[in-house]
């Protein structure tokens, strides 16, 4: 028969014959022959291959370096890489999460719109009229101004985006 020029899925062409690729989690040791199938062996500890392949070396699992603020979110297997995330209060600097930076705090006048996660920074928003934030915080939202009316008080000092209103007693009507 004519030697093949193309092979099926999960096969590769070598020496005019189709050999099976190695399954995820295994590496290639030797191509198939007319007598034996492709020889594949498992990746070692701390190694992985995540696709059907003909790689002769497995990839090393990612190292989550605590010196860079990283910790393991999901331990790698022979078929998957380790997933790193950042320690509490830190977030990844990139999608690959190779290092971490401290979560940003929202300055007075700004509140937290979205609390940071291990992979995303704090999102701040300016406090709109009627709201304020007087602290620098990575957690605090803008607080609404105190409603003096509900306390039977009147506004003595208007609020800003950084300060609450100051309420005081209502002036008595003079006779």
């Amino acid at each position: 028969p004519e030697p093949p020029t193309a092979c099926r899925e999960k096969q590769y062409l070598i020496n005019s014959q189709c050999c099976s690729l190695c399954q995820p989690g295994q590496k290639l040791v030797s191509d198939c022959t007319e007598f034996t199938e492709t020889e594949c062996l498992p990746c070692g500890e701390s190694e992985f291959l995540d696709t059907w392949n003909r790689e002769t070396h497995c990839h090393q699992h990612k190292y989550c370096d605590p010196n860079l603020g990283l910790r393991v979110q999901q331990k790698g297997t022979s078929e998957t890489d380790t997933i790193c995330t950042c320690e509490e209060g830190w977030h990844c600097t990139s999608e690959a999460c190779e290092s971490c930076v401290l979560h940003r705090s929202c300055s007075p006048g700004f509140g937290v719109k979205q609390i940071a996660t291990g992979v995303s920074d704090t999102i701040c928003e300016p406090c709109p009229v009627g709201f304020f934030s007087n602290v620098s915080s990575a957690f605090e939202k803008c607080h609404p101004w105190t409603s003096c009316e509900t306390k039977d008080l009147v506004v003595q000092q208007a609020g800003t985006n950084k300060t609450d209103v100051v309420c005081g007693p209502q002036d008595r009507l003079r006779a």
Partner: antibody, heavy 115, light 110 residues
């Protein structure tokens, strides 16, 4: 069809080194590992180590670590196994074989260590 | 001292079946489906007859079969023939790019 042809018999003095060659033909040389196995007279098979199909990375049995060196010359499709600090108990037939599975074997090389 | 344990000898009459065991540990035979069996006639290089626990290279008769249970692999030669008289060795992958052999079994056809 892969064929492995080994170098001829050697007689060595204790303390010296021996270098056995294994020339491959057929197939793609860089696409299969080569294991080395030895067999002392009247004894069983003993795996010594292997050299990776690409890049020449090696893995040696603990027993031979520090005494064995496996190399390859891609230009001549030849793999070499060098054993140093020879002792009489290293007298054996040394085989090269394809892969860990060892589906093809060389004819063997007798190494005699004697003073 | 071999890493895998085989009986030193086994025997059977022509036409009979004989089984050879190969016992390892949970780090080699038990851990991987990478057990091979070799036949070696005196003065010859070994020949692969079984790989990946139970697969036969093409050209090896189906009289040779093999299996694995736990840390023990077994080779069965059925319909024994005079030419089956030889030494038989098992091997197993042991992780970290290492391989281990059994001590070998001398099969005698009575």
């Amino acid at each position: 069809q892969v064929q492995l042809v080994q170098s001829g018999a050697e007689v060595k003095k204790p303390g010296s080194s021996v270098k056995v060659s294994c020339k491959a033909s057929g197939g793609t040389f860089s696409s299969y590992a080569i294991s080395w196995v030895r067999q002392a007279p009247g004894q069983g098979l003993e795996w010594m180590g292997m050299i990776n199909p690409s890049g020449g990375t090696t893995s040696y049995a603990q027993k031979f670590q520090g005494r064995v060196t496996m190399t390859r010359d891609t230009s001549t499709s030849t793999v070499y196994m060098e054993l140093s600090s020879l002792r009489p108990e290293d007298t054996a037939v040394y085989y090269c074989a394809r892969g860990f599975r060892m589906d093809q074997w060389g004819q063997g090389t007798l190494v005699t260590v004697s003073s | 001292q071999s890493a895998l344990t085989q009986p030193p000898s086994a025997s059977g009459s022509p036409g009979q079946s004989v089984t050879i065991s190969c016992t390892g540990t949970s780090s080699d035979v038990g851990a991987y489906n990478f057990v091979s069996w070799y036949q070696q006639h005196p003065g010859n290089a070994p020949k692969l007859i079984i790989y990946d626990v139970r697969k036969r290279p093409s050209g090896i008769p189906d009289r040779f079969s093999a299996s694995k249970s736990g840390n023990t692999a077994s080779l069965t030669v059925s319909g024994l023939q005079a030419d089956d008289e030889a030494d038989y060795y098992c091997s197993s992958y042991a992780g970290n790019n290492r391989l281990v052999f059994g001590g070998g079994t001398k099969l005698t056809v009575l």
